[in-house]
């Protein structure tokens, strides 16, 4: 675990150009705040780190769908 506690992030000023394997991802949040410079998706990894990604990229959309399916299956 990190040595100090994180607070929720608000904006992505840049996005990653590397594809993150789906098995490393735990959840995601859409960033649509009008005050942020760009629309983005923030993935949370199983390690607890956050990754800014471009929702226009195919791997990002596929990862979001996959995580949606996982959460849907968890619902009673």
């Amino acid at each position: 675990q990190p040595d100090s506690v994180s607070i929720p992030i608000t904006c992505c000023f840049n996005v990653i150009n590397r594809k993150i394997p789906i098995q490393r991802l735990e959840s995601y949040t859409r960033i649509t705040n009008i005050q942020c410079p760009k629309e983005a998706v923030i993935f949370k990894t199983k390690r607890g780190k956050e990754v800014c990604a471009d929702p226009k990229e195919r791997w990002v959309r596929d990862s979001m769908k996959h995580l949606d399916q996982i959460f849907q299956n968890l619902k009673p």
Partner: antibody, heavy 119, light 107 residues
Amino acid sequence: QVQLQESGPGLVKPSQTLSLTCTVSGGSISSGGNYWNWIRQHPGKGLEWIGYIYYSGNTYYNPSLKSRITISIDTSKNQFSLTLSSVTAADTAVYYCARDGGDDAFDIWGQGTMVTVSS
Amino acid sequence: DIQMTQSPSSLSASVGDRVTITCQASQDISNYLNWYQQKPGKAPKLLIYDASNLETGVPSRFSGSGSGTDFTFTINSLQPEDIATYYCQEYNNLPYSFGQGTKLEIK
């Protein structure tokens, strides 16, 4: 294009505290998803990861150095810093700052700054 | 901590040769491995991530493979500008650890 630049004293006396700063240009240190790291390389040797800080202040330190290091961030100056206390000759190294985009790959590095510990 | 063992520690090869470097982890790290190139007096540069994915802008003569504990880094046709030291880095566990490096020279 984000660039990193280390700065600090090139010579530190044994038992003193080493302080280094990394200035981020071409982008905001406050961006989500960026983890700001310190890595060092002893002369003629391999690389040793020291620790990281997130813009929120969240840190993780290498346990081998944890008792002696502090990594801090100043978002107003677009800088993050390393302090290493009680230095010895074994802390003589090139110190690099580097960014990872949350996926644990160091994709942007500073050019490195050589720090010698000597009386 | 996970120990990363690279071999060989140094090697000499001719322009056009196929060069292979290996990295062995002390425990299973899946494919959580990166490769870096460090030229003399310069900072390391990311070449390969997730064991086999080429970083943007890196020439296709570089490649990586492997999973678990055994990994391979290959330069398909060695070029003079490839003179450097190459490092593997695992990220399965924190703290991150690097191999000791492989110094590549041209014959």
